[in-house]
Every structure is written in C-alpha cells, then in structure tokens.
Interface confidence: low
C-alpha cells in the first residue's frame, strides 16, 4: 500500500487548499528530472537553467562552459550535439514537429577551436535527421529523404542515396508506421562503433494506401495531408538494409544486407539493428504474422566488400501462445567476446527473463528467473550486468535497478535501488557513462522525483542532481489525494489497481467513482510513480474516487495475462474493468449510481466498449481519440495482436469488436466523444464512424472535435479539453460548479 503523507496535523488544515483545475493546466506542480549527457566515462554535459552548455568532470569536480547562451541565442538554438572529438557542436533551431518522434530543423555547426560558425558548404534546410559519427567529427544527415555524408563539417557533402522521394522512398528515416509502431525513433541509420561503416534502412512506400485528411489552417481552402499509412491487412512498406563504407563511400557504394531466407519467404519487417564491432552487425527481422522473429549476425567480407549472414548465426525466437516479445521484440546486448549476447525473452514458465545466448537459443542460459519480469538491460560490462525488474516485494508496478556480477562465479545479484529511499522511490530508471564508471538514477516516485549520481563500482551516491525542492515547497499547503496500490484476486486472475482517494476520505461515506483506463496490450497503468494531474484534481477538489486497473493484456506479470487478449482485442480488457468496478462497489464507499469511465486512444476504445457493455454499471463516460474498429488502425500494431482481417484468418473478430456494432447499447448512458481532426495516428475516421452509427441508431450523445489537432490534443486544446471533460463529469455526478 502506498499512502501519500498529508504532511500536516489537523490544526494546520485551514491553511491547506485543494488542487484546482488551473493548477493542473498551468503545470504548477510539474517535476524535473536530470539525465546527464554522457561524453566519456567521467564527464557529462548539461544545459544549465540560463542555457549555457556546461561540461562536468566527476573525478576532478570541475565544470566549465563549452558553449555560451549567447552563442545558442545567436541562432535561436533549442538543442545541441557535441562531436566526439570535441571540436564542433551542432546547434538545432527552427524545430518543426512532424509525427511522434520525427521533426525537421535547421542546423548550424559551431567550431569550438576558433569560436566561429563553420562557413562554406553549409547544411541545407530543413534537415530531417543529423548525427555525428561515434568517433571524430563525420556527419551523416537526411535531407529530402536522401542520406548525405560529410567527412568534416566544412567539407562538401557526399550523397549516399538518390532515390528518396516524399511519401514514396525514405532513406535513413522511417515512414509513418515504422516510426510509430516498430522503431520508435525519428532515425533509421546507425554508425558502426568507430564510424567506419554507416548502416541505413530504405523504406519503399510506393504501394501503400494513403490516408488523406483536411488541415483547415487559415487559408480559403483547407490543404490535404497525405500519409502512406498501412491499415490492418493493407500493403506494407518494403524495407531494405544497406551498409556503406564511410571512409571510401564511392568505392563500392552501399551494400545490401541479405534477409534470412525463412523471413524473406513472406511479408516481413525489419525490427532493429545493433552494431557489435566495426565489422559485425546484428539485424532483427520479424514475419508479418508477428510470432516469429529472427536475429541475424552478419560479418563484413573484406575480399568481396559485402556482408555475409551465415545461417549458423541466425537465432529464431518464436511465440506459441501470442506474439513475439512484449510490446517490441527485445534487442540484444552483446558481451565483450562480440558474439555472445544477453536478451530478454519468455522462459518456460511464461515470464520475461534475461537469457545468455552463446551458440543457439535452445542452449540459452537463463540469468534471471521467478514470477516477476526483467524489463530492461541497461549495460553489460566485463564484470557486471545492470538491469531493471519488478521483483522487489512482488509489486508489478515498481522498477528497481539490479546488478549481477558476471565476472565472478557463481554470479551474485544485488538490488542497487531497493533500499535507497524506500518510501519515496520505488520506480527507477538509470543512465550509464562509458564502461559504467558512473551512473545516474532517476526516481519517478511514488514520492517527489529525485535524480542522483552514483559510483559505478561501489554504487555509492556521489551527489543529488535534482531533488525538486521548489515542488516540495509548493506542495506543502496542498491537500493532495491519498493513493493506494492493491490487488484483487478474481477467478485465478490478479487485477492490480491504483485508487486515488479524496484527502478527507471516509470509508463510511459514498463517493462517485471514475475509472481511468488505457488497457492496451503490454501497457501498464498501475505504477508507483508521482503525478499531480487531472485525476489528482478530481479527487482533491471534486471529491471523486479514481481507479486505474491493469487487466488481462497488460504487461510485466507473465505471458498468461499478457497474451490472454491475443486475437481477441476488446473482450477481456473490458470484462476486467467491469469486474473491478463490481469489486469496488462491494467495498462499500462507492455510490453505484455515480460511476463513470474515461480513456484516451486504446483507453477510448475500452471505455466505449465498457459503456456499451449493457451492464448498467456506468452512468456516463468519455472517449478521447478512440479506435473504433481495428480495420482502421495501423497494420504493424493491429496485426501483432489480431492477425489479419481476412476470412481465413480473423476477420470475424475484427467485425465483432467494433464500437459501431454496439451503437444501440449507448442508449442508456451519457457518452462524450472527442477527437482531433488532424489525428495522424488514430484517424478522425474512427470517431466519425462511431458518430454515424449512433446517429443511424438514433442514440443521443455529446461530441467535441478539435480542429487541426493531432492525437495529443496539445496547446490550448488541452485546456479546453480538460475543462470540457470536467464540466461533463460534474454534470454527470450532479456536482455543483
């Protein structure tokens, strides 16, 4: 149980105030984290509050400004990148967002040796992606879907690809679906460890159907946004991987890396690339039916100037109960012998654990085990492996950092974070310097977040990097809600939930209940993290109880729970929310005539289906940017969990799981449907179809659209959205304004 201390005695209560909606919309109680920008084993860069770029040396304790805020301001730079030889800095300005990760920008190169910007052979604009080589100061960049290389910043560029074309061929950057659903990056190029080779992906979207939507803007005529976007079952991008020698790029040109035969026999994806050495690379591939993944280790053949991927270096990962991996297939972390590696995948009991692969996957040595899951491998050194898991005290919504000593026999395991600040910190991530000489720990809660610096050998805390003192002081006179994390055991299923309770919560009274749901495959909502957000306000000021429940399909509790939703999205996720609500009613403090549910994206889909479940449990609910039919969503994501919408595969469940099919069932609930018209991710089409079905069924409902807003509904739309939803809920719960 996690109870946030109220921090005061009753005598002080008259000086305390509840959270207001304005507090939330203004970000009054937002927190800061500190992630060092590591540049060596003992040095890191950080952008100071006054915008100077400062280099810190942990061992000498010295710091100095390498780039002044004056230089940054001279080109309106919002970001920077130091070349590994420390001779140049790129300055990024004119940031222009595209999709979730992608953006374009203007780049200037500043020469630190003479204190001037590099003139001559300036970079074109806007650039889609730019990065330094890992050694020296070579530059690779993507401009108009083609890749260019500079040996030095002032040199003329060498053009590597020539076939790049908007919305057709993408070189070195992903198309929409690879960016959002596979790579989760804005880039698709990778330097070898010493910068000898550059690997890149080419995505051919020529045959992909295009989603088109209006962007209204301010002009007389709206413009049309066209995105090659493969929906479930549609034609997918065709991917190829190339590698070029950057020392002599014109010598043989880009060489294609062969696709494993068992993958190439049908539609497939490329999922990630990991360099092992300058002349060894590891590629991961995935069948379109995403239950088979192949990891292929390829070697450079000097004599032929080609890349060879022997079958003996192909490692197959297959799931017989669901899809391969968790949300993504995990990536390998190679050991110092440059052939064996560590990787997280399901063990025989169906829990994701770290395995060590030396020759074949069948002979893998299991490194961690138990009825919990290893979540991320941060770093492998010669003698230690650092990873995160949710093992400690059997709370799946926690994250602690562990060290396994692999240099000694038998290997010993130590929890680095479990007892550091036990009440305040139960959810950590980490960032390691070269060779793990030092590391930063970033604690996200449940108390106020704190970032600290540690010695990589002894784990001793060296200093606090950020402790959010201002936030702590600002919260001293705020009546925060109480939070508890507990579990329900129902029919051999464990349902973890987080309940957010009003500050003066009294179990003998009755409270309106709001369920906040996401519920997507491999997600987790019940986490021991700090947040002061909209639902905190609803509990603090409006006296609501808010609950979040992790049901079937959610992550980090084993494959049985995770893969329960395989090929049947929209069934068990909804059932488990309903089951939890019934259990909450049994607790005695919920007013069963005032229960609502709300969610965004996948959560909008689940909330819509829950409202249309015909149970009579919910008085009202909100769906923000919901999926309404899996036929409308992206192939890579949808097919991972649902298979194909064909008669000989899973078309029947695609049809049965739509929100539209349940239009009649909305008759007895108050439904608020919200969507941005320029949503590139979950297309406005989804809500348009719900609205049409409700109109055709003559069912009353409320709706709000946000013109030219995407899936995030950002800026002023955010304020409008939360104000609108607050009014809707207060009306539903008969709370006075």
């Amino acid at each position: 149980i996690v109870l946030r201390p109220s921090r005061v005695h009753n005598s002080e209560e008259n000086t305390m105030r509840a959270l207001t909606l304005k507090d939330i919309l203004n970000g009054t109680f937002s927190y800061k984290t500190f992630f060092p920008n590591w540049i060596s084993g003992q040095e890191y860069l950080h952008q100071s509050a006054d915008n100077n770029i400062v280099l810190y040396n942990i061992e000498t304790g010295q710091s100095y400004t390498i780039l002044s805020n004056r230089t940054m301001k001279s080109v309106n730079a919002s970001n920077y990148g130091l070349s590994p030889d420390r001779q140049f800095v790129y300055l990024e300005s004119d940031y222009s967002k595209l999709w979730r990760y992608s953006y374009t920008a203007t780049y200037y190169i500043y020469d630190l040796s003479n204190g001037e910007f590099v003139r001559g052979n300036e970079l074109p604009r806007p650039i889609q992606y730019l990065c330094w080589s890992p050694v020296g100061s070579k530059l690779a960049y993507v401009y108009q879907n083609n890749i260019y290389l500079k040996q030095r910043p002032g040199d003329p560029p060498f053009q590597i690809t020539f076939n790049g074309r908007e919305n057709k061929i993408f070189n070195g950057i992903p198309d929409w679906v690879y960016e959002e659903e596979m790579l989760a990056t804005k880039y698709a190029l990778w330097w070898s460890p010493n910068g000898k080779f550059l690997a890149y992906a080419e995505f051919n979207d020529t045959d992909i159907p295009v989603i088109a939507y209006s962007y209204y803007g301010d002009e007389q005529y709206p413009r049309t946004i066209n995105i090659p976007y493969p929906k479930a079952g549609a034609k997918n991008p065709v991917v190829r991987i190339f590698i070029i020698d950057t020392t002599y790029p014109a010598y043989v040109g880009p060489q294609e890396v062969p696709v494993p035969a068992m993958i190439a026999s049908s539609d497939y994806y490329f999922s990630w690339l990991t360099w092992v050495t300058d002349e060894r690379v590891c590629l991961q591939w995935l069948k379109r039916v995403q239950n088979v993944s192949v990891l292929s280790i390829c070697d450079f053949r000097e004599d032929w100037q080609t890349w060879d991927c022997p079958k003996t270096q192909e490692h197959i990962e297959e799931s017989r109960t669901g899809w391969a991996g968790g949300f993504f297939v995990s990536t390998p972390v190679f050991s110092y012998d440059a052939i064996s590696y560590y990787k997280i995948f399901s063990d025989k009991d169906g829990y994701k654990h770290i395995h060590y692969i030396k020759d074949t996957v069948e002979n893998a040595i299991q490194i961690t085990s138990g009825k919990w899951e290893a979540i991320n491998i941060f770093r492998v050194t010669q003698d230690s492996l650092f990873y995160s898991s949710n093992e400690f005290e059997e709370y799946p919504g926690r994250r602690n950092i562990y060290r396994i000593s692999i240099g000694s026999y038998p290997p010993s395991k130590k929890c680095v974070t479990c007892h550091l600040r036990k009440e305040r910190c139960q959810y950590y991530t980490a960032s390691f310097s070269d060779y793990a000489k030092y590391y930063a720990l970033v604690c996200y809660g449940p108390g106020i977040p704190i970032s600290t610096l540690h010695d990589g050998r002894t784990d001793q805390e060296i200093k606090i990097l950020e402790e959010n003192k201002e936030l702590e002081n600002a919260l001293k006179n705020i009546q925060l809600p109480k939070e508890e994390i507990k579990k329900l055991e129902v029919d051999e299923i464990t349902l973890w939930y987080k309940m957010i309770l009003p500050p003066q919560f009294d179990r003998s009274k009755k409270y309106p209940l709001l369920i906040q749901v996401y519920g997507g495959p491999c997600s987790q909502s019940v986490r021991s993290v700090f947040a002061v957000n909209w639902i905190s306000y609803l509990a603090s000021k409006e006296g609501m109880v808010i609950a979040l429940v992790d049901g079937r399909g959610t992550a980090f509790q084993g494959d049985k729970l995770l893969y329960a939703v395989y090929r049947k999205l929209g069934v068990y996720e909804v059932e488990d929310q309903i089951t939890a609500v019934r259990k909450f009613i049994e607790m005695g403090f919920i007013d069963e005539k005032r229960i609502a549910i709300w969610g965004w994206s996948y959560g909008g889909y689940v909330s819509s289906l829950a409202l249309a479940s015909g149970t009579g449990l919910f008085k009202c609910g909100i769906a923000v940017a919901p999926v309404s039919s899996w036929e409308y969503y992206a192939s890579v994501y949808t097919e991972r969990f649902m298979g194909l919408p064909t008669k000989d595969d899973n078309l029947e469940h695609y049809k049965n799981s739509t929100v539209m099919a349940r239009a009649e069932y909305f008759r007895n609930v108050d439904y608020l449907l919200i969507h941005g018209t320029a949503d590139d991710n979950v297309h406005f089409q989804n809500s348009a179809q719900i609205a049409k079905a409700l109109v055709n069924a003559q069912v009353d409902f409320q709706a709000m659209w946000y013109s030219d807003q995407n899936h995030g509904l950002s800026g002023l739309s955010t304020n409008h959205l939360y104000t609108h939803m607050t009014h809707f809920l207060k009306q539903c719960f008969s709370l006075s304004d």
């Epitope: 159907p209 295009v210 989603i211 088109a212 929906k231 479930a232 079952g233 549609a234 034609k235 036929e631 919408p645 064909t646 008669k647 078309l651 089409q685």
Partner: nanobody, 118 residues
Framework: EVQLVESGGGLVQPGGSLRLSCAAS????????MGWFRQAPGKGRELVAA????????YYPDSVEGRFTISRDNAKRMVYLQMNSLRAEDTAVYYC???????????WGQGTQVTVSS
C-alpha cells in the same frame, strides 16, 4: 450472386481519354474496397488504381499518377476510372475488382479491352 461488370473500353489515340465504368450487384458495394487492375499481353496483372470504401483514400502507382482518377458512387453502386493522356503502354484488358480489405481482392469483373494506338 456477386457481379462486377465493366464498360467503356475501346480504341483511342495516344493522348486521348477514356472513362471506364464498373457496375456492382449482389452485395453492398460501399462495404468493399474497389480497384482497377490491368493485364497487358504476356504480363502479370497490375493494380492501377484503388479507392477506399468511402472514397476518402485513393492509391495510384507512379506509372499512372496524375493521369488516372478513380472515383465511386456508392448510391449507384458504380466505380469509375477516368484515364487521360493515354499512352501505347496503357494498352491492356482492364478489370474492376472488389475486396474486403486493401489488396485482398476476391471479386473480379470479366474485363474490358483498352487499346491505345494511332
């Protein structure tokens, strides 16, 4: 019985135009994605235009983009292919097709011949 019937083919000079029509019966055409394919002698079947159920999304390969336009009238259960600036290499039998998802076309018409020649 699902039926697709094409019409509008014929002989046309290079640079000329033709409008092909496809009448659908036996199913609710708005349910399906519709496409126009062509097959030249000795060659495989090639998709030249596709349109989503509502007509909101269309697709053309590079070879016809800007010259061909696909449209549909769900009320009349018709799909059209407007072909402008025709070239000799556009000579083929043109087929109308319907499918339950993109690129899975399970219903086909008998085809209509288009010949571009001077």
């Amino acid at each position: 019985e699902v039926q697709l019937v094409e019409s509008g083919g014929g002989l046309v000079q290079p640079g000329g135009s033709l409008r092909l029509s496809c009448a659908a019966s036996g199913f609710i055409s708005s349910y399906y994605y519709m496409g126009w394919f062509r097959q030249a002698p000795g060659k495989g079947r090639e998709l030249v235009a596709a349109i989503s159920r509502t007509g909101g999304s269309t697709y053309y390969p590079d070879s016809v983009e800007g010259r061909f336009t696909i449209s549909r009238d769900n009320a009349k259960r018709m799909v059209y292919l407007q072909m402008n600036s025709l070239r000799a290499e556009d000579t083929a039998v043109y087929y109308c097709a319907a499918g339950d998802i993109n690129y899975h076309y399970n219903y086909w018409g008998q085809g209509t011949q288009v010949t571009v020649s001077s």
